[in-house]
Interface confidence: medium
């Protein structure tokens, strides 16, 4: 069983899923309002968003006291965060600016990918090996959307029987999408295109918030019960509480290299020939050059106009 990394508003913690009754280890303490969290295992980096400080920060998890600011301007409520461990990019949602943005892992070369028809975007999940990203929106027209990680091919994949879609996670091996709905109190799964939808846990969960997966087990945080729960990802059986009495459980991830499988990085050689951003794409050549917001890509499709 994995270590589970979760945001707890005041801190980030790690708890062993097999021994959840033990105290969790504080990875980073003294935070204001940590909401979303993710990591790049191969780089030893943990990222989180703080919705009170309106910032995204990171730390090296094998070093103490190494907190760095990554994004500190232009954020209002960065509720969702995801690391592209393959293309070495950072993606985030902001439910107040109503944007989904991308940048390098150090926060540089920031680009707004989506800014229209977003209401309350929350969870975001990446599948870098296929070039797709997924996010939930619990606004007036709740939905789950999919798009290329380069901002292309945006498509609504779930928009029925959905109310407060909070948690979202991908099963890379089985090619499945799982999500938790806090209003309808369930966990459902589907194919990555939204087809073949099935219930995993029917409407009995008080307030599921964030969701992750490791091997055959789903793990999620629940706001109402202040705990982390788990069940079998196929059947929903074996539903149990594995870690309780959490101050304010927010985002959660199975903290393991297994959750960030290696694959060919189409941007790996010479940044794909791109002068600035090289983003994963679902269509050949499986990457797309891009420029920071406000800077134009020249007709060669590789170079950003001077001044970026």
């Amino acid at each position: 069983a994995p270590l589970l990394l979760y945001a707890n508003r005041r801190d980030l913690r790690l708890v062993d899923a097999t021994n959840g009754k033990e105290n969790a280890t504080i990875v980073v303490g003294g935070l204001e309002d940590a909401a979303a969290v993710d990591f790049v295992f191969s780089h030893g980096l943990i990222y989180w968003s703080d919705v009170s400080e309106e910032a995204i920060k990171r730390t090296e998890f094998n070093k103490t006291e190494s907190v760095q600011n990554v994004v500190v301007s232009g954020l209002l409520s960065p509720d969702g965060l995801a690391c592209d461990w393959l293309g070495e990019k950072l993606y985030w949602t902001d439910s107040e600016t109503n944007r989904i943005e991308v940048s390098n892992l150090d926060g540089s070369l920031r680009k707004v990918l989506f800014w229209q028809e977003l209401d309350q975007p929350r969870a975001i999940a990446l599948d870098p090996s296929s070039g797709f990203m997924y996010w939930t929106d619990w606004g007036e027209v709740p939905k789950i959307e999919r798009a290329g990680m380069d901002g292309s091919s945006r498509f609504i994949i779930i928009n029925s029987e959905i109310y407060w879609p909070n948690g979202l996670t991908l099963d890379y091996e089985e090619q499945k999408l799982y999500w938790a709905d806090a209003k309808l109190n369930f966990i459902h799964k589907s194919n990555l295109d939204g087809t073949n939808r099935q219930a995993v846990v029917k409407g009995s969960l008080p307030h599921p918030f964030a969701l992750t997966l490791f091997e055959d087990i789903l793990y999620w945080t629940d706001w109402s019960t202040h705990s982390i729960l788990a069940c079998n990802k196929y059947t929903g059986e074996g539903l149990r509480e594995i870690h309780s009495d959490i101050f304010s459980p927010m985002d959660i991830h199975a903290f393991s290299q297994q959750r960030q499988p290696n694959a060919t990085n189409p941007c790996g050689i010479d940044n794909g020939g791109c002068s600035h951003l090289c983003l994963m794409s679902p269509v050949k050549p499986f990457y797309q050059c891009a420029c920071p917001t406000g800077v134009k890509l020249l007709e060669n499709g590789k170079t950003c106009k001077d001044g970026a």
Partner: antibody
Framework: QVQLQQSGAELVKPGASVKMSCKAF????????IEWMKQNHGKSLEWIGN????????KYNEKFKGKAKLTVEKSSSTVYLELSRSTSDDSAVYYC??????????????WGQGTSVTVSS | DIVMTQSQKFMSTSVGDRVSITCKAS??????VAWYQQKPGQSPKSLIY???NRHTGVPDRFTGSGSGTDFTLTISNVQSEDLADYFC?????????FGGGTKLEIK
């Protein structure tokens, strides 16, 4: 509709224990915590603690640890508050309320009518 | 513990007036503040959650504002039925704490 029904007024002798109830109607009992408050006759409200019927998780205000005990009877959707070793300081009205989670907040939305406790010999 | 201070214990107003009741937190509580109304002989009733959001069924003459440490409940066009005690609550950190209350009196 959502309703919390509290047990009737109690007259308690000093040193004795008193147990009051809060019965929930009109919603899924295990989906929400029950919060308990004390209101002195001087009108200020104090949070005693909460009980979540989904996982029996209990949180107490340090001030009331050893004084208050929260328990549940799930079959009747009832949460109980027991006060031990009563003193005149425990004379007050005790309210239960449903702890409500919206999708980015929690607060107390529905309140019981209150149980008045008087400690007197 | 976080202390919520309602400095005005009593406020006097007339029907049709606008009145603002304030609450100050001893530390930053973001916007995790709720307001409750308690009429004589009744239990508290939820008015405002998350500092500025009206609960279902609450008249729009009740408005909440503020974040961080300073919060205000404003009642515009005061009605005689608004005679009550008003409490603020912070649920940013345990233990949850209430303000001491402000009694609204109608002249």
């Amino acid at each position: 509709q959502v309703q919390l029904q509290q047990s009737g007024a109690e007259l308690v002798k000093p040193g004795a224990s008193v147990k009051m109830s809060c019965k929930a109607f009109g919603y899924t009992f295990t989906s929400y915590p029950i919060e308990w408050m004390k209101q002195n006759h001087g009108k200020s409200l104090e949070w005693i603690g909460n009980f979540h019927p989904y996982n029996d998780n209990t949180k107490y205000n340090e001030k009331f640890k050893g004084k208050a005990k929260l328990t549940v009877e799930k079959s009747s959707s009832t949460v109980y508050l027991e006060l031990s070793r009563s003193t005149s300081d425990d004379s007050a009205v005790y309210y239960c309320a449903r702890g409500y989670s919206g999708n980015y907040f929690s607060a107390m939305d529905y309140w019981g009518q209150g149980t008045s406790v008087t400690v007197s010999s | 513990d976080i202390v919520m201070t309602q400095s005005q214990k009593f406020m006097s107003t007339s029907v049709g007036d606008r009145v603002s009741i304030t609450c100050k937190a001893s530390q930053n509580v973001r916007n995790d503040v709720a307001w409750y109304q308690q009429k004589p002989g009744q239990s508290p009733k939820s008015l405002i959650y998350l500092a500025s959001n009206r609960h279902t069924g609450v008249p729009d003459r009740f408005t909440g504002s503020g974040s961080g440490t300073d919060f205000t409940l404003t009642i515009s066009n005061v009605q005689s039925e608004d005679l009550a005690d008003y409490f603020c609550l912070q649920h940013w950190n345990y233990p949850y704490t209430f303000g001491g209350g402000t009694k609204l009196e109608i002249k």
